[in-house]
């Protein structure tokens, strides 16, 4: 990792596992966009690979609500509204950081967790496997 | 918020702003996927709305490296490889949580921050077909 110069104004850590356990201020710095993707974009309906958004809720996780995209079709929508099965709608996935309460139910102790979420869908050309 | 039953085995918090400041274990729980999106999928190249991935690095942030998608074209790519301007390539954006060192350079004190990242691109059309 990158060596960070110690600032004399930093909080002290008595934790034996330092720097694996750190203090985190949950007062989120910038809230300039909506957490509900339906409010922040309507691409899910206008895309040639449209998707539906499913609410995933877990009170032991922060954020407790995450929206998961599920592609509506196997193929992609053409200009005439029909589905073209020569193309594929596929989910674009991203790893995100969440905080998991650990031990469970503890209000002020968390563990960092990486989870894979589907953010939306895109239309791709299928991989053609040429059989010898 | 949801009321969490207090577990007697929970760490104690003396912070006056509790529960805004919490303890977080940075030992990430599941690393089952690759953090470099170029390794985890080739959709960025096969999509009708292809994108390039740009590395955004910030040592004051955790994770310090984030990949940003930039759509390659204004239009979408047709089967013959030409760009179709009857449609647009647009970035799918998602809010993610990151940890920002606060005060700056402190190794064990962070603030939660929401940032908007472009994860990939999708192809949108002006004609919306409401599929049942």
């Amino acid at each position: 990792g990158i060596a960070i110069p110690r600032n004399s104004g930093c909080p002290n850590s008595e934790d034996k596992n330092f720097p694996r356990t750190v203090m985190v201020n949950l007062n989120i710095h910038n809230r300039n966009t909506s957490t509900n993707p339906k409010r922040s974009s309507d691409y899910y309906n206008r895309s040639t690979s449209p998707w539906n958004l499913h609410r995933n809720e877990d009170p032991e996780r922060y954020p407790s609500v995450i929206w998961e995209a599920k592609c509506r079709h196997l193929g992609c929508v053409k200009a005439d509204g029909n589905v073209d099965y020569h193309m594929n709608s596929v989910p674009i996935q991203q790893e995100i950081l969440v905080l998991r309460r650990e031990p469970r139910h503890c209000p002020n102790s968390f563990r960092l967790e990486k989870i894979l979420v589907s953010v939306g869908c895109t239309c791709v050309t299928p991989i053609v496997h040429h059989v010898a | 918020g949801i009321a969490i039953p207090r577990n007697s085995g929970c760490p104690n918090s003396e912070d006056k702003n509790f529960p805004r400041t919490v303890m977080v274990n940075l030992n990430i729980h599941n690393r089952n996927t690759s953090t470099n999106p170029k390794r985890s999928s080739d959709y960025y190249n096969r999509s009708t709305s292809p994108w390039n991935l740009h590395r955004n690095e910030d040592p004051e942030r955790y994770p310090s490296v984030i990949w940003e998608a930039k759509c390659r074209h204004l239009g979408c790519v047709k089967a013959d490889g030409n760009v179709d301007y009857h449609m647009n390539s647009v970035p799918i954006q998602q809010e993610i949580l990151v940890l920002r060192r606060e005060p700056r350079h402190c190794p064990n004190s962070f603030r939660l921050e929401k940032i908007l990242v472009s994860v990939g691109c999708t192809c949108v059309t002006p004609i919306v077909h409401h599929v049942a």
């Epitope: - | 204004l74 239009g75 301007y85 009857h86 647009n88 647009v90 954006q93 472009s118 002006p126």
Partner: antibody, heavy 118, light 110 residues
Framework: EVQLLESGGGLVQPGGSLRLSCAAS????????MSWVRQAPGKGLEWVSA????????YYADSVKGRFTISRDNSKNTLYLQMNSLRAEDTAVYYC???????????WGQGTLVTVSS | NFMLTQPHSVSESPGKTVTISCTRS????????VQWYQQRPGSSPTIVIF?????PSGVPDRFSGSIDSSSNSASLTISGLKTEDEADYYC?????????FGGGTKLTVL
């Protein structure tokens, strides 16, 4: 219902500056490209500038390139047009429009009049 | 930049059909959508046809759009003319770098 409300127009001297705003409502602002179109008194429509939904791409007519700057604040659902080095020929009603895709303006505001005169 | 050429004015009687043409000077019209806007005196433009032939909700089916690739032109046809159709009509198209409007056609309903 899509609503676009322009403001910021007025009388300005040649060489002066003005900033137009367009407050949008009734749709998910950040997922639509937006444009500015103007109409000189008694004349036809002239496209001025456009910006992508994320704000990452901007486009300008040759007549305003280097003088006008389009921008947007998606957290405020607002589109802007910063107009510098104004000329008499910039006198027009300025409309903001919501683009269904690039080049396809679907909804228009009521316009704001900019008069450049000494 | 390309140009879009429209007739300066057209006139027709109520109940009849009128067609307004729009010719693109360069670049294939079929590669980019054509839109048509109606502007009544003292009002903002409103879209009556987008994406060559799509009618927004609220626009009567008396309005229709088409394109002819062979002549590189688009047409707006209004059937069953009504007095409220009297307005200026603008065609509009684009390329990857700019958006262009036609000069406008004044429709007079006699």
């Amino acid at each position: 219902e899509v609503q676009l409300l322009e403001s910021g127009g007025g009388l300005v001297q040649p060489g002066g500056s003005l900033r137009l705003s367009c407050a949008a409502s009734g749709f998910t602002f950040s997922s639509y490209a937006m444009s500015w179109v103007r109409q000189a008194p008694g004349k036809g429509l002239e496209w001025v500038s456009a910006i992508s939904g994320s704000g990452g791409s901007t486009y300008y007519a040759d007549s305003v390139k280097g003088r006008f700057t389009i921008s947007r604040d998606n957290s405020k659902n607002t589109l802007y047009l910063q107009m510098n080095s104004l000329r008499a020929e910039d006198t027009a009603v300025y409309y903001c429009a919501r683009d269904l895709i690039w080049g396809v303006a679907g909804s228009w505001g009521q316009g704001t009049l900019v008069t450049v005169s000494s | 930049n390309f140009m879009l050429t429209q007739p300066h004015s057209v006139s027709e009687s109520p109940g009849k059909t009128v067609t307004i043409s729009c010719t693109r000077s360069s670049g294939s019209l079929a590669n980019y959508y054509v839109q048509w806007y109606q502007q009544r005196p003292g009002s903002s433009p409103t879209i009556v046809i987008f994406a060559n032939n799509q009618r927004p909700s609220g626009v009567p089916d008396r309005f229709s759009g088409s394109i002819d690739s062979s002549s590189n032109s688009a047409s707006l046809t209004i059937s069953g003319l009504k007095t409220e159709d009297e307005a200026d009509y603008y065609c509009q198209s684009y390329d990857p770098h700019s958006v262009v409007f036609g000069g406008g056609t004044k429709l007079t309903v006699l």
